[in-house]
């Protein structure tokens, strides 16, 4: 009598995640009587994948009708494959008994699963930073297999080199994740800049996946302040302007102080954008000189994006004759520096 053979013709099968995998198995003889079961892995820790007689295996179906007479084909199809399904599958013949006794195993078929990386997600710094400072961006992508993957960073189309990338886990796994950090030095012109994380993998049809982040979310451009006095009007009123230029984001509060007392507070809103993405704002204050005996100390105080206030102060000379007032006189800065200090 010829010895029963359990034939698994394929040593290995590779499928794409989401597809179905067919694992072939035939037996050379109908005797002895007894069931066939499919396992993943070998030894005592093996996992039962399919048993015709009992159990619920919603993703596993027999390729041919196992109930038909003289059936010797015990191939199975596993639907909706995920990376977690990777492993070596064994078709095992049992001899009928109480309990059934394992008789012979096939050589095993290794199932390899190729899976696409998830769309890269780029996250930036939690708090804004100013020009000349370095900020870090992180890019993450998950669930890919095999492990080989390339990740590149670009800022405005130019590849970044200050990059640290890790693929986890280091050892063999059903799927992998990549995490990369890029360090970017900010400039005042970066409001419209963009960083791109580009991931390439064998499963992608030639086109890398991209994740983006706008530097506008990461940058703060502090304002320049300039206070000027226009020529005195006939009604003894002086028009003083505070020009706040080249700032980002728009969140800005401007306060006028006369001799240290709050005169008016304004909030910036709906400002037109400069070409470089920054904003300008001009505020006017009319000072009635005839209402003052002494010189008036005016302060333009700007609070930008929750940062410490920047002041620009100067004095309106009350003693001077109106006709002698020069036009468009720039104020002296008696307050803090015109740029924020961090």
């Amino acid at each position: 009598e010829e010895e029963l053979q359990v034939i698994q013709p394929e040593k290995s099968v590779s499928v794409a995640a989401g597809d179905s995998a067919t694992l072939n198995c035939t037996v050379s003889s109908l005797i002895p009587v007894g069931p066939i079961q499919w396992f993943r892995g070998a030894g005592p820790g093996r996992e039962l994948i399919y048993n015709l007689k009992e159990g619920h295996f919603p993703r596993v179906t027999p390729v041919s009708d196992p109930t038909k007479r003289n059936n010797m084909d015990f191939s199975i199809r596993i639907s909706n494959i995920t990376p977690a399904d990777a492993g070596t599958y064994y078709c095992v013949k049992f001899r009928k008994g109480s309990p059934d006794v394992e008789l012979k195993s096939g050589a095993g078929t290794e199932l390899s699963v190729r899976a696409k990386p998830s769309a890269p997600v780029v996250s930036g710094p939690a708090v804004r930073a100013t020009a000349e400072h370095t900020v870090s961006f992180t890019c993450e992508s998950h669930g890919f297999s095999p492990r080989d993957i390339t990740l590149k960073w670009f800022k405005n189309g130019n590849e970044l080199s200050d990059v640290q990338t890790n693929v986890d886990p280091a050892g063999k796994s059903v799927s992998y994740s990549i995490r990369s950090t890029a360090r970017v030095v900010l400039t005042r012109r970066d409001v419209h800049s963009q960083v791109i994380c580009e991931v390439a993998h064998v499963t992608l049809q030639g086109d890398p996946l991209r994740g983006t982040a706008n530097l506008s979310e990461a940058i703060r451009v502090p304002p320049f302040l300039e206070v000027t006095q226009q020529s005195m009007r006939a009604d003894n009123q002086v028009n003083v302007t505070c020009q706040v230029t080249k700032f980002y984001p728009q969140r800005l509060q401007l306060t006028w102080l006369e001799n240290g007392n709050v005169s008016r507070t304004e909030m910036a809103s709906a400002l037109p954008e400069n070409k470089d993405g920054t904003y300008n704002w001009t505020s006017w204050l009319l000072v009635n000189v005839s209402a003052h005996r002494d010189d008036v100390k005016l302060t333009c105080q700007v609070e930008h994006d929750g940062q410490p206030a920047v002041n620009k102060s100067f004095s309106v000379k009350v003693s001077a004759h109106p006709k002698e007032q020069g036009s468009n006189t720039a104020a002296e800065n008696t307050g803090t520096n015109e740029r924020n200090i961090y």
Epitope: A16, P146, D148, A200, H201, V202, T203, Q205, G206, D207
Partner: antibody, heavy 116, light 109 residues
């Protein structure tokens, strides 16, 4: 699923020539496609690929001599200025469904002969 | 660019023989290697992908092995229809470029 090349002919050195690859049974917007060539009695040589979205990538030796493009149903290889060493059978092929590391569907090839 | 060195460049064998063809990459290509069979005047046919996976419809007498830089195509029992030229082809996941070996012609002894 199949691919077929066309446009191969006798061409003069210095003249342009465009080869086409027509696909059936699948969409060019879903797969990477490649161009290859084989000089008489020689081995296979990779020319370039075009990605599913239409981005071309070339072998380092191409140096701007060839241009790969595609429409919804055909992929083209434009040879800007023929040289005698371009005499070869040109094949187009489609990458496999599992990834871009192998080509599982090949056309029969089209012969380009460059001679004055 | 990666170089693929295939050996031997030709071999003579008889029907039923076990035939082994090797391919060496100038740097690691992991398992991104395919084997093709080509007959005169015909297009290449895919036999093996990912170094060891048999393409559907290809007879099981063909097998592939190896990873990194050294790869092997084995025909366990040569059949009359197997007399052809065999090419290895690599894909490098960093440069995303393809390279072929120079081919191995299997002839009848």
């Amino acid at each position: 699923q199949s691919v077929e090349e066309s446009g191969g002919r006798l061409g003069q050195p210095g003249t342009p020539l465009t080869l086409s690859c027509t696909v059936s049974g699948f969409s060019l917007s879903s797969y990477v496609m490649g161009w290859f060539r084989q000089a008489p009695g020689k081995g296979l040589e990779y020319i370039g690929i075009i990605s599913s979205s239409g981005s071309p990538y070339y072998a380092s030796w191409v140096n701007g001599r060839f241009t790969i493009s595609k429409t919804s149903t055909t992929m083209d290889l434009k040879m800007n200025s023929l040289r005698s060493e371009d005499t070869a059978t040109y094949f187009c092929a489609r990458v496999g469904p599992l990834g871009v590391d192998y080509f599982n569907i090949w056309g029969p090839g089209t012969l380009v002969t460059v001679s004055s | 660019d990666i170089q693929m060195t295939q050996s031997p460049s030709s071999l003579s064998a008889s029907v039923g023989d076990r035939v082994t063809i090797t391919c060496r990459a100038s740097q690691s290509i992991n398992s991104y290697l395919a084997w093709y069979q080509q007959k005169p005047g015909k297009a290449p046919k895919l036999l093996i992908y990912s170094a060891s996976f048999l393409y559907s419809g290809v007879p099981s007498r063909f097998s592939g092995s190896g990873s990194g830089t050294d790869f092997t195509l084995t025909i366990s029992s040569l059949q009359p229809e197997d007399f052809a030229t065999y090419y290895c082809q690599s894909w490098h996941y960093i440069s995303r470029s393809y390279t072929f070996g120079q081919g191995t012609k299997v002839e009848i002894k």
